[in-house]
């Protein structure tokens, strides 16, 4: 007994399609061994026709493909424009020869069943509508006019000219003539399902002068769309449902035990399961819409149906469009947290994945909301101004290159909790679900600058602290100045080599700014955080206010230009045993350097290149310094 | 919603045939896969697949079958009835069991149950040695 499982028998007609899936067993070798068709001829050689080597026989040139589902053990073979020399007996199988593991499908392509000569054949999708023309003549005009589906015996009415009609026609059937033209009438069947595919004969006037014609009607199910996407990335099904039901409500659903499980409607009705990661979005006129399901996850996987009614939930007769989802746990998007957790008054830094061979992609945040359809307005970009309610507590920093953009968001309040989400306008899969959780603070936070009230004086020099706790003390620190482009790091040198001790004392760690002369630019919101590397963490921000010099109040000196232009990481040492070398910060390019030019300055790769200018053109300073004051025990 | 009620079942001797129909009703019938799986006795809650049937429109069929029933047991439809027949021949003692006839709208695999929709209540079948 084979373990390879697929159709006995597949029957269809000339000029149809056929989708025969094979299914194998869950093994690694299984999942990545040859595929292939074969068909059997009289001295039980089987002959390849396509396989997932790439090989495509000539006769099945254009119209045939053999797609393989390593994560569903499956592998499909789709072949279009079927001929009855198509009629045979194959093998589906695996291995390197066609001797392997494999399974035997008997292929039967029929004629097109004999019909009348004068047969009008009309194919529709279920839950669409017909409409059936009959022709008659003139002296049929003032004759009753029927239209029947034909049994195995007789001819059932479905309705006729009297306004008979057949009860499973009732409200779908209309039997009608259209303007003056007495020699046509026509019968319009709506919302069709596969009970109405037959054979019919509309008819006007009776006996032997009778007008008939026959009519074939086909009722097709949409075949499921495979769709094959990776864990924790996002799908989108687009659903084309057509004209007529343009005003109706749209639902996305999925196949469950005994029903079609409602995921999401127009009408707002939302599957808890996929709070936070899903949106409906009416795409015109015509009854388009689409569904955007973002992080992925394994349960995702099964069989989901769009549809349309004015119920927004699944109706016989109703069109339908389907897909079958396979969710592949293989995936090439990282496995980040997918809650991030807050306190009021702090900061959460959070590293979006994108796809690394895009580091020249635009990146936004957006804020999921779930009211409505739901909708993901953008909060910050690359190219994206924050949003002013967001203003001083909001940045994006693109890392280029590295697959990682970070989104700073600090001064946190309980409304910010929800739900976040990470896009690019490049790979769409790689949009990703950050849920945000934000608690009351319990304790004072890991950073605090001081003085809190900053008021700087105009030409003055003027100096912010930033206090930071001895689990700090190896990370890397920053001062940044914030605008709605971005916060961009104040410039730094590196005063080379400083030796500390073991000891810490968590009263002196501090990183200084200091503005000085302080010009009007400088009012506004700055920051101060810590990072290792490319790996941003936590953050406070300040507003510094800038006030004209009242009378009396001391004139500093503006210093020599290039003084003004540095800002030293200072560190005050006592006593050592540990070297600690602090990390540059080179000034960041203006908000249109190109990619290449920012790819080139190397570890400049960590700023944000949405940001504004590094320094003031008239040669103010922007200074940050780091005390460490360590006693040895 | 949809309801399968199936017939047929009876006593019958090793080797004779029996015929099963499993009659949709209820909202008007539009899955398009069916089968037919069983229940030996003492074997409960396991089901074990018999015979599918997948159909992509009134033109192209799909039919599965178990090993175990392969060359005995035909699957068909009659669409105008509503109505999904299971023809078993050559039957042994070993396919004594409850028969249950399933739909739904699609399934990843005709021989996993729980991907149909809709169950009947059964039918029994004994076959006699």
């Known amino acids: 007994k084979s373990p390879i499982f697929g159709p006995q028998e597949v029957s269809s007609i000339e000029g149809d399609s056929v989708s025969i899936t094979c299914y194998y067993p869950d093994t690694s070798v299984n999942r990545h061994t040859r595929k292939y068709w074969c068909r059997q001829g009289a001295s039980g050689m089987c002959t390849t026709l396509i396989s997932s080597n790439g090989y495509l026989s000539k006769e099945y040139s254009g119209r045939a493909n053999l797609i393989n589902f390593p994560e569903n053990n499956t592998f499909v073979i789709n072949i279009e424009q079927l001929t009855q020399d198509d009629t045979g007996s194959y093998k589906c199988g695996l291995g390197t020869s066609n001797r392997g593991l494999s399974f035997d499908v008997s292929l039967e392509v029929s004629q097109v069943p004999e019909l009348p000569s004068d047969t009008h054949v009309y194919t529709k999708d279920i839950g669409r509508n017909v409409t059936i023309e009959c022709p008659f003549k003139r002296e049929n005009a003032p004759s009753k006019k029927s239209l029947c589906k034909k049994t195995n015996q007789s001819c059932e009415l479905v309705i006729d000219s009297t306004e008979k009609v057949n009860p499973s026609y009732i409200g779908r059937a209309k039997l009608f003539m259209k303007g003056t033209d007495l020699t046509v009438f026509y019968v319009n069947i709506s919302h069709l399902t596969h009970n109405d595919a037959g054979l019919y004969i509309c008819q006007a006037g009776e006996g032997p002068s009778a007008d008939k014609k026959n009519v074939d009607l086909q009722v097709l199910a949409p075949e499921p769309e495979l769709l094959y996407k990776d864990l924790r990335s996002s799908v989108t099904f687009e659903c084309d449902l057509g004209r007529e039901v343009a005003n109706e409500a749209k639902y996305l659903c999925r196949m469950n035990k005994e029903t079609c499980d409602v995921i999401i409607n127009t009408l707002g009705k939302r599957d808890p399961d996929f709070e936070g990661r899903i949106l409906i979005t009416p795409k015109d006129d015509n009854g388009r819409f689409s569904v955007l399901i973002t992080g992925l996850r394994k349960e995702d996987a099964g069989h989901y149906q769009c549809g349309a009614h004015s119920s927004g939930l699944p109706q016989e007769g109703w069109p339908i469009q389907t897909w079958q989802l396979f969710v592949n746990e293989e995936s090439t998007i990282p496995n980040r947290r997918s809650v991030v957790k807050g306190v009021t008054g702090g900061s959460v830094a959070i590293a979006c994945p994108y796809n690394p061979k895009e580091s020249s992609s635009l990146k936004y945040w957006c804020r999921w909301e779930g009211d409505g359809n739901g909708h993901c307005p953008v909060l910050v970009g690359t190219q994206a101004q924050v949003q002013e309610e967001y203003e001083g507590r909001l940045a994006l920093f693109d890392q280029p290159g590295n697959g990682t953009y970070t989104v700073i968001l600090n001064q946190l309040t309980t409304e910010d909790a929800g739900f976040y989400w990470c896009l690019t306008n490049g790979d769409s899969r790689w949009r990703t679900t950050i849920e945000l959780q934000v608690a009351e603070a319990t304790r004072e936070p890991n950073l605090e600058v001081t003085p809190q009230n900053a008021t700087a004086v105009l030409g003055e020099t003027f100096t912010v602290s930033c206090h930071y706790p001895c689990k700090f003390y190896s990370q890397e620190k920053y001062w940044c100045k914030w605008s709605n482009k971005g916060c961009h790091i104040l410039p730094s040198h590196d005063e080379g080599a400083r030796q500390s001790s073991v000891s810490c004392d968590q009263s002196s760690q501090l990183v200084s700014m200091t503005l000085n002369p302080v010009s009007k630019e400088d009012e506004g919101w700055y920051w101060c955080g810590v990072k290792q590397g490319q790996t941003y963490g936590e953050t406070t921000a300040i507003y510094i206010a800038v006030e004209e010099r009242t009378r009396g109040s001391s004139h500093v000196n503006p210093t020599d230009a290039n003084a003004r232009a540095k800002v030293a990481l200072e560190e005050e040492v006592v006593d050592s045993s540990i070297s600690e070398k602090e990390n540059k910060a080179i000034p960041n390019p203006g908000p249109f350097a190109n990619e290449r030019e920012i790819q080139n300055v190397g570890d400049q790769a960590q700023e944000n290149r949405a940001s504004g200018d590094a320094g003031s053109a008239d040669g103010q300073s922007r200074s940050s310094s780091s005390k460490h004051h360590h006693h040895h025990h | 919603e949809v309801q399968l009620v199936e017939s047929g079942g009876g006593l019958v001797q090793t080797g004779g045939s029996l015929r099963l129909s499993c009659a949709a009703s209820?909202?008007?019938?539009?899955?398009?896969?069916m089968g037919w799986f069983r229940q030996a006795p003492g074997k409960e809650p396991e089901r074990d697949f018999v015979a599918a049937l997948r159909w992509s429109n009134d033109r192209t069929y799909y039919k599965y079958y178990a090993d175990s029933v392969k060359g005995r047991f035909t699957i068909s439809r009659d669409n105008a009835k509503n109505t999904v027949y299971l023809q078993m021949n050559t039957l042994k003692p070993e396919d004594t069991a409850v028969y249950y006839c399933?739909?739904?709208?699609?399934?990843?695999?005709?021989?996993?149950?729980?991907?149909?929709?809709?169950w009947g209540q059964g039918t029994q079948v004994t076959v006699s040695s």
């Open positions: 399933a739909g739904g709208n699609y399934f990843s695999d005709p021989r996993v149950d729980k991907e149909y929709n809709y």
């Open positions: 209820g909202r008007t019938f539009s899955s398009y896969a």
